[in-house]
């Protein structure tokens, strides 16, 4: 039978005794920055071109004995996982290897930078098809390494990296923390986060998704026909690099933003046991395990969205947190979350010609997160409409008044430290879906978008008694763009989107006691694009 | 031995290029910053990536590197330019004493300087 990891990434319709992906990634070139490799291994011979690039530090220790098979071990295995004939993900992809790690698996930030520069220069000298760069390495947070990754990504290159094997927040490592890079954590055959000795896979908001990374069979540099199992986030990243190569081979025009959204969309959802992660990281860590799309074409009609969490604001009184979408994505809604419940809401604001989502901490709060809902919406024209706090007891309301604009998200932000907890709950007048409603002491922000064929609807789920979590999901064919809570009162910790479900969290009832105003309503805005659907049908 | 000769050549070149003149102070109001790895065992002091402002041309990068060498030589320090970056980020990789960081941060076009650090196979 096929190795568990190849079975896991194969969608059910392709499942058989063999791994038979629909396309082998033959139009794509994958660059591997790693150790040296054994290029005559039967898995990869003729598939991997060893470039003359080498930038590695000397090995530590005076008695270090350089043994070829040890020097090549890591890189050979990863090359096999990406494109190996027997145990590879993208069996048609061609690869180029650059040596940036020495025989002990150690390199430098500067050597990696020079390697990335080498790739960019190669791309300029001889433009080929889509490029994927696999970085199965990690160091401490590095501004310069992240900046280089950003530049290369903006030149149209897809970068995939290991989240790191430190059982820690991936945001503390580079290139894992670079927003433009696709950062991959590791899971095992039971879809659990991988433990590696006393450590394990990294986690947190800088991880985009997880992939198989334990007991992965692949080429061994011991001999030209040898295979071995290895584990780590490098192996997980290699799976995603292979999946990316296959997706790009099927649709070479995909942008990085489109590719990332598809990787997220086609992942297995909610299969990872989050109890493995530290409690404060669970909400930030994506519960996604990478998989191939069920078919290589026909995904274009869908409205794709993802959730982007900001860094923590920190606890100071005026602290704010900002979440940003990728350059090709539209910010369709903005929400906030605070574990202490002390926050002053969130707002969408322009920054450098693009909308960002900013959340505000409150006095005595431990800090907030901003949560952006970032979507692919071609030809979109979005704007934010704001209503200042209303004096009327009916609350503040704002709607999309421009012709053809639809409501994609609602945010509320208040200057007062505490919204009155005993104010009557605000009720939305029925039949006004294009309207955001909030507390009378809050300013309300409506995200209004015009895009061909875009239609949206509001879906609510209210629970009369206080509950820690209220959810509402969009139905099949609709995509969650906005997630907020009614009313915007202080016992609500915040709202955020998980896949296609809007989650509203409230303070633990046992600690707050019952309030007269325990009702919490989760409000989801669900959208779809008829235009994208039509365009897809015309293509087919 | 080879390295020592190389360093000697660098010093000669650096002294010769003093005609480049003193470094002007960076543009008013912009201060270059220094970054280093938060994980101490992973730090590689003595090697620095000097990152220049976004629109800096290759010739300016080379000139800035030579200027750093000249000013360092005047203070009795040997420096070695290991690589000049262009294509992704403008800047250069330099082997030098940490004593020269203050000087380097004042060079024109400098955006920030990062001490080199280790990366590891995962």
């Amino acid at each position: 039978s096929i190795p568990w990891n190849l079975e896991r990434i194969t969608p059910p319709r392709y499942r058989a005794d063999e791994y038979q992906p629909p396309d082998g990634g033959s139009l794509v070139e994958v660059y591997l920055l790693d150790t040296s490799i054994q290029s005559d291994h039967r898995e990869i011979e003729g598939r991997v071109m060893v470039t003359d690039f080498e930038n590695v530090p000397e090995e530590d220790g005076t008695r270090f004995h350089r043994q070829a098979s040890k020097c090549d071990s890591h890189g050979t295995h990863l090359a096999g996982v990406v494109s190996g004939r027997d145990a590879g993900v993208a069996k048609g992809a061609s690869m180029r290897s650059l040596r940036v790690l020495n025989c002990q698996g150690k390199g430098t930030v500067s050597g990696t930078l020079i390697g990335l520069e080498f790739i960019r220069k190669s791309q300029l000298v001889q433009p080929v098809g889509p490029l994927v760069v696999l970085l199965p390495l990690a160091g401490g947070y590095s501004r310069v390494l992240n900046a280089a990754c950003q530049r290369l990504a903006r030149a149209g290159v897809v970068l995939v990296t290991a989240a790191g094997n430190f059982r820690d927040d991936a945001c503390l490592y580079s290139p894992a923390s670079a927003p433009e890079v696709i950062t991959v954590g590791a899971t095992n055959a039971q879809d659990q986060p991988v433990t590696l000795g006393t450590l394990g896979t990294n986690f947190g908001r800088c991880v985009d998704l997880f992939a198989p990374g334990e007991d992965i069979i692949g080429a061994s540099s011991d001999c030209s026909t040898c295979f071995v199992s290895q584990s780590g986030t490098s192996q997980a990243a290699a799976h995603v690099a292979g999946i990316a190569a296959m997706m790009l081979s099927a649709e070479p025009e995909l942008t990085l933003a489109e590719l990332r959204q598809r990787l997220i969309h086609f992942s297995a959802k909610d299969v990872i046991n989050e109890a493995w992660f530290p409690e404060d990281q669970r909400v930030l860590t994506p519960n996604l395990v990478a998989a191939l799309p069920p078919s290589t074409h026909g995904a274009g009609w869908q409205l794709f969205c993802r959730t982007v969490w900001s860094a923590h604001s920190g606890p100071t009184r005026m602290a704010t947190a900002v979440a940003r979408c990728a350059p090709d994505e539209e910010l369709l809604s903005c929400s906030s979350f605070s574990r202490s419940g002390k926050r002053r809401g969130e707002r969408m604001e322009a920054q450098g010609g693009k909308l960002v989502c900013r959340a505000h901490n409150a006095f005595g709060g431990e800090g907030v997160y901003a949560i952006a809902r970032c979507c692919l919406l071609p030809q979109a024209n979005c704007s934010v409409h704001t209503a200042p706090p209303a004096e009327a007891s009916m609350g503040t309301r704002v709607h999309c008044h421009q012709q053809g604009h639809v409501l994609t998200g609602c945010s509320s932000h208040w200057e007062v430290e505490d919204l009155g907890t005993h104010k009557p709950p605000v009720l939305r007048p029925r039949g006004q879906p294009n309207q955001c409603v909030g507390h009378r002491e809050a300013s309300i922000h409506a995200s209004c978008c015009h895009a061909p064929g875009l239609e949206c609807k509001v879906k609510e789920h209210g629970i009369p008694a206080p509950q820690e979590q209220v959810t509402v999901a969009c139905e099949e064919g609709w995509t969650l763009t906005g997630c907020s809570a009614l009313p915007g009162t202080s016992h609500v910790l915040g709202a955020y989107a998980v896949d296609n479900t809007c989650v509203v969290r409230s303070r633990d009832v046992s600690t707050t006691g019952s309030t007269s105003e325990g009702a919490v309503t989760a409000v989801a805005i669900c959208c779809r694009s008829r235009h994208l659907a039509q365009a897809s049908q015309e293509l087919q | 031995q080879e390295d020592e000769d190389g360093d000697y050549e660098e010093l000669v070149l650096a002294l010769r290029s003093e005609e480049d003149g003193l470094a002007e102070a960076p543009e008013h109001g912009t201060t270059a910053t220094f970054h280093r790895c938060a994980k101490d065992p992973w730090r590689l002091p003595g090697t620095y990536v000097v990152v220049l402002k976004e629109e800096t041309h290759l010739s300016q990068s080379e000139r800035t590197a030579r200027r750093l060498q000249a000013q360092a030589a005047r203070r009795g320090y040997l420096t070695k330019i290991l690589h000049v970056f262009h294509g992704l980020l403008p800047g250069f990789l330099v082997k030098m004493s940490g004593d020269l960081l203050e000087l380097a941060l004042k060079l024109p076009h400098v955006d920030y300087i990062e001490e080199d650090s280790s990366v590891f196979a995962q």
Epitope: P3, A16, R42 | -
Partner: antibody, heavy 119, light 113 residues
Framework: QVQLVQSGAEVKKPGESLKISCKGS????????ISWVRQMPGKGLEWMGI????????NYSPSFQGQVTISADKSISTAYLQWSSLKASDTAMYYC????????????WGQGTLVTVSS | DIVMTQSPDSLAVSLGERATINCRSS????????????LAWYQQKPGQPPKLLIY???TRESGVPDRFSGSGSGTDFTLTISSLQAEDVAVYYC?????????FGQGTKVEIK
């Protein structure tokens, strides 16, 4: 079920060309390597070479390099062994064999093709 | 090339008795990364293609009777038939698959005494 079916016995004259075949069924032919093994009358097994039908990558034993050509047509799940100029010493039973997954050892064998070269 | 040498060339054993075949490789086929020996054993009966019995030097292929066992490591290996049956009359080959070219031993003929 998984099987390899080889073409029938051949009687040829020295200097003639020949192409024998091995058709795979019951599995994804593209994803498994096929080896060719020679057994001369009353002798042992000799590995000749191997092909990966997915991309037609081949590896030959030095003893057979330049003497034979291994090829495959994945569209019809068939591997081939051919000679451009047969010699009397090529008289033997030729087996095709499928690799065990990611192990170059042979779990499925063809029934064999007897090639007789005689003037 | 790795040369495989089997001994004896032929072996006559009474029914129900133990048969032991040895195989030596000219270089080690044991690899440290997965601690496996890249050695297999095949059985070939007259007029039939060979059949895989053992791989990784000691792992029995599914469907193979448990009277067949493999042992050894590095360069020296043994195939043992614990209680010879009439249907075990055949030629047995060892094979290394650690590197190209793949090589076989010259074969050991097992007969009933």
């Amino acid at each position: 079920q998984v099987q390899l079916v080889q073409s029938g016995a051949e009687v040829k004259k020295p200097g003639e060309s020949l192409k024998i075949s091995c058709k795979g069924s019951g599995y994804s032919f593209t994803n498994y390597w096929i080896s060719w093994v020679r057994q001369m009358p009353g002798k042992g097994l000799e590995w000749m070479g191997i092909i990966y039908p997915g991309d037609s990558y081949t590896n030959y034993s030095p003893s057979f390099q330049g003497q034979v050509t291994i090829s495959a047509d994945k569209s019809i799940s068939t591997a081939y062994l051919q000679w451009s100029s047969l010699k009397a010493s090529d008289t033997a039973m030729y087996y095709c064999a499928r690799d065990y997954y990611y192990k170059p050892l042979f779990d499925i064998w063809g029934q064999g093709t007897l090639v007789t070269v005689s003037s | 090339d790795i040369v495989m040498t089997q001994s004896p060339d032929s072996l006559a054993v009474s029914l129900g008795e133990r048969a032991t075949i040895n195989c030596r490789s000219s270089q080690s086929v044991l690899y440290s990364s997965n601690n496996k020996n890249y050695l297999a054993w095949y059985q070939q009966k007259p007029g039939q293609p060979p059949k895989l019995l053992i791989y990784w030097a000691s792992t029995r292929e599914s469907g193979v009777p448990d009277r067949f066992s493999g042992s050894g490591s590095g360069t020296d290996f043994t195939l043992t038939i614990s209680s010879l049956q009439a249907e075990d009359v055949a030629v047995y080959y060892c094979q290394q698959y650690s590197s190209f070219p793949i090589t076989f031993g010259q074969g050991t003929k097992v007969e009933i005494k």
